[in-house]
Interface confidence: medium
């Protein structure tokens, strides 16, 4: 379920945005850089898929959102949502923020201002 | 097999310092943070704080800051708990423990602080 | 600092009997919550961990639930082996705390 987020902006414009693009790339690619390239993750198999590649894509499809620099921070918390569940210590939890917060600048975006992961009602 | 082995039991005098090893093996160490937990005789749980096996970051509760310090050995995959200052007090089994779905326990090390 | 309210302190129950115990948190911690059981002169063990995964090979007779302020660990039938204290330990923020414990016991 997607929880309201309350930010700065358009913040229902980015939500539609983030809701057409396919984050899983973005989400696999993090796991991959936690979790290490030899393991498979959950339902993901994620060797099948190297890591580079999954950086591309992820970027591309973060590139689909008409306003990707103003709703990077949505797309952002989105995947701390979606894989919120999947983190079972709190070092994942840190790694996985930190690597999340790396992402626009791995995609040659300029990271957002400010933006808050937590976001999961607790969860994360 | 994944496992957390502590060092054995210590007796010291008050004032004395303390260093608890704790290795882990049958996991990748830098994967999982590592608590350290507290059992006074006759006790419940009191959770000393965590080390975060990749960034080397140590948390302390409030009532373990100062005389504890948590630090990390990844060449040879162990954790240490190091008590300086020693009060009678701190007389209690000290616990490794892994959080999460591989959540693993140390079976205790026994510190004894008696003049 | 987020604290965790254990009830009851002491059980006792027949074997065979479903068993429940509660743990209550001051704020919400989502399902950052595990179950530790510990025998007496052992070490502690995971049971449960976020809220309702069972540990592997811990029994299925253990079950947790909840979320946010308000948990529970269940033994569904009571067997002589589970005689033990069993503790609820939130681990939401960077900090983690423990609850008091209930021991479990054969009457």
């Known amino acids: 379920m997607r929880r309201e987020r309350g930010r700065q902006g358009d913040s229902s414009s980015c939500e539609r945005q983030v809701d057409r693009v396919n984050l899983k790339p973005c989400e696999q690619h993090i796991m991959q850089r936690i979790m290490g390239e030899q393991e498979q993750y959950d339902s993901y198999d994620i060797r099948s898929t190297r890591s580079s590649d999954q950086q591309q894509r992820c970027c591309d499809e973060l590139n689909e959102m008409e306003n990707t620099q103003r709703c990077m921070c949505e797309a952002l918390q989105q995947i701390m949502e979606n894989q919120c569940d999947r983190l079972q210590d709190r070092q994942m939890v840190q790694q996985f923020k930190r690597e999340l917060m790396n992402l626009p600048q791995q995609c040659n975006f300029r990271a957002p201002q400010r933006c808050d992961l937590d976001v999961s009602g607790g969860r994360c | 097999e994944f496992q957390l082995v502590q060092s054995g039991s210590e007796l010291r005098k008050p004032g004395a310092s303390v260093k608890v090893s704790c290795k882990a093996s049958g996991y990748t160490f830098t994967k999982y943070g590592m608590n350290w937990v507290r059992q006074a005789p006759g006790q419940g749980l009191e959770w000393m704080g965590w080390?975060?096996?990749?960034?080397?970051?140590?948390t302390y509760a409030q009532d373990f800051t100062g005389r504890f310090v948590f630090s990390l050995d990844t060449s040879v995959n162990t954790a240490y708990l190091e008590i300086s200052g020693l009060k009678a007090e701190d007389t209690a089994v000290y616990y490794c423990?892994?959080?999460?779905?591989?959540?693993?326990w140390g079976q205790g090390t026994t510190v004894t602080v008696s003049a | 600092d987020i604290q965790m309210t254990q009830s009851p302190s002491t059980l006792f129950a027949s074997v065979g009997d479903r068993v429940t115990i509660t743990c209550r948190a001051s704020?919400?911690?989502?399902?950052?919550l595990a179950w530790h059981q510990q025998k007496p002169g052992t070490a502690p063990k995971v049971l449960i961990y976020?809220?309702?995964n069972l540990k592997s090979g811990v029994p299925s007779r253990f079950s947790g639930s909840g979320s946010g302020t308000d948990f529970t660990l269940t033994i569904s039938s009571l067997q002589p082996d589970d005689v033990a204290t069993y503790y609820c330990q939130q681990y939401n923020t960077y900090l983690g705390t423990f609850g008091q414990g209930t021991r479990v016991e054969i009457k």
């Open positions: 423990a892994t959080d999460g779905s591989e959540g693993s």
């Open positions: 976020k809220a309702s």
């Open positions: 704020q919400s911690i989502g399902t950052w």
């Open positions: 080390i975060n096996t990749n960034t080397a970051k140590p």
